[in-house]
């Protein structure tokens, strides 16, 4: 594994082919997560920011930007949308989670909660996933579409098994997170497939 | 099969410093947290700190922050850790771990170096 | 800091009996948990991580459970090996800490 701290996936170009697997053992069926990430892009159109299919399932977890100011959740196939004022261009550290026994997803963007959303009470999300940044998975691990593509830089990325507390998220968007035991940028496996480049992280 | 072997016993004055070595054999030394945990005479457990090779990134436990060094040699395969202005207190047996491949767990452990401190 | 408190901090066992250790922590540490045994004069060896999955190579008689606050090593029928001191450590919040150990003797 390898830690990038400092270090961002920069993803050049629009494509059908450019991505990065990120590779976690994950056993167990989650019922609980916190996502947490950073991401700089430039563009106006919608795209996928974190990809999670498992065998047979799509969209079994998708962070997904619909347009400026919008940023999606999906788990199991549905769907929830928050909205928020932001800048464009600019860099944006963006949270996730979500909690099964209520179904509530929760965004926070730059360090503020945006109005929580309600979805797929009492669901578990699929363990074994493959998980892609830079593109949006429809099948498992692939099936990509270049509209939905990804072009710029993300890092930071740290997922957990839990709903994180408020105080956990603003330490992670101050860039001291707590250990991650999904994904941890500090301790990465991961894979890149076609033309993604390793850069320092010059925008904070 | 990765093997931490560490360096033999010491002894030290108070307020002198030691230098614990932890050499990695059979695996791929730079892509792992490399952690040191101490053991005092009888007792528990407790985490000092951790370094990445790659990344010469270090975190530390805030109590020995500002008497503790952790360093790693790439070349040699080899992670250090430096305690300062030792005290009686240090007396323990120090033992570098690796961080397994998924988890914040510790896996492979060295055979622990016996640092004694004594005037 | 986040205090590992273990209990019992020593018990004594017979071969082939059921033994179980608990590990409460001062705060939520969700399922972020691990086990490791110790012999003296040896370093520790991990057994349990996330609360509940055995490492490799790890006889099945032992098994972990529990999350949040409360965490449960349990061996299933003690073998003469065993007789060690068993540790839990939590891995969710720096810095990484350990409950001060339960030592488990043969009666």
């Known amino acids: 594994h390898t830690d990038l701290s400092g270090k961002v996936f920069v993803f050049p170009r629009e494509s059908v082919t450019d991505h990065v697997n990120l590779i976690t053992p994950l056993e167990k069926p989650l019922q609980n997560f916190t996502l947490c990430f950073r991401a700089y892009s430039d563009l106006s159109r919608a795209y996928s920011l974190f990809s999670y299919n498992t065998q047979g399932r799509d969209n079994e977890l998708l962070v997904y930007k619909e347009r400026v100011g919008e940023y999606s959740l999906y788990i199991g196939r549905h769907k929830v949308t928050s909205k928020v004022i932001e800048k464009f261009p600019a860099p944006v550290h963006i949270c996730v989670s979500w909690e099964s026994s209520s179904g509530i997803a929760e965004f926070w963007i730059n360090g503020t909660p945006l109005v929580k959303k309600g979805l797929r009470q009492g669901y578990f999300v699929e363990a074994q996933p493959k998980i892609v940044l830079g593109q949006e998975q429809d099948s498992y691990g692939g099936k990509f579409d270049r509209s939905q593509s990804f072009v710029g830089e993300i890092g930071d990325l740290y997922m957990w098994d839990s709903v994180l507390p408020p105080e956990n998220i603003l330490s992670a968007y101050q860039g001291t997170p707590l250990p991650a035991n999904i994904l941890d940028w500090q301790a990465l496996n991961y894979e890149i497939r076609g033309y993604v480049i390793i850069k320092p992280l010059v925008w904070v | 099969q990765v093997q931490l072997v560490q360096s033999g016993a010491e002894v030290k004055k108070p307020g002198s410093s030691v230098k614990v070595s932890c050499k990695a054999s059979g695996g791929t030394f730079s892509s792992y947290w490399m952690h040191w945990v101490r053991q005092a005479p009888g007792q528990g457990l407790e985490w000092m700190g951790m370094?990445?090779?790659?990344?010469?990134?270090?975190n530390y436990n805030e109590k020995f922050k500002s008497r503790v060094t952790i360093t790693a040699d790439k070349s040699t395969s080899t992670a250090y850790m430096e305690l300062s202005s030792l005290r009686s207190e240090d007396t323990a047996v120090y033992y570098c771990a690796r961080r397994n491949d998924y988890y914040w767990y510790f896996d492979v452990w060295g055979q622990g170096t016996l640092v004694t401190v004594s005037s | 800091d986040i205090q590992m408190t273990q209990s019992p901090s020593s018990l004594s066992a017979s071969v082939g009996d059921r033994v179980t250790i608990t590990c409460k922590a001062s705060?939520?540490?969700?399922?972020?948990v691990a086990w490791y045994q110790q012999k003296p004069g040896k370093a520790p060896k991990l057994l349990i991580y996330?609360?509940?999955y055995r490492y490799s190579g790890v006889p099945s008689r032992f098994s972990g459970s529990g999350s949040g606050t409360d965490f449960t090593l349990t061996i299933s029928s003690l073998q003469p090996e065993d007789f060690a001191t068993y540790y839990c450590?939590?891995?969710?919040?720096?810095?990484?800490?350990f409950g001060q150990g339960t030592k488990l003797e043969i009666k």
């Open positions: 370094i990445h090779p790659n990344s010469v990134n270090t």
């Open positions: 450590q939590q891995c969710n919040n720096y810095p990484f800490t």
């Open positions: 996330s609360a509940s």
């Open positions: 705060q939520n540490v969700n399922s972020n």
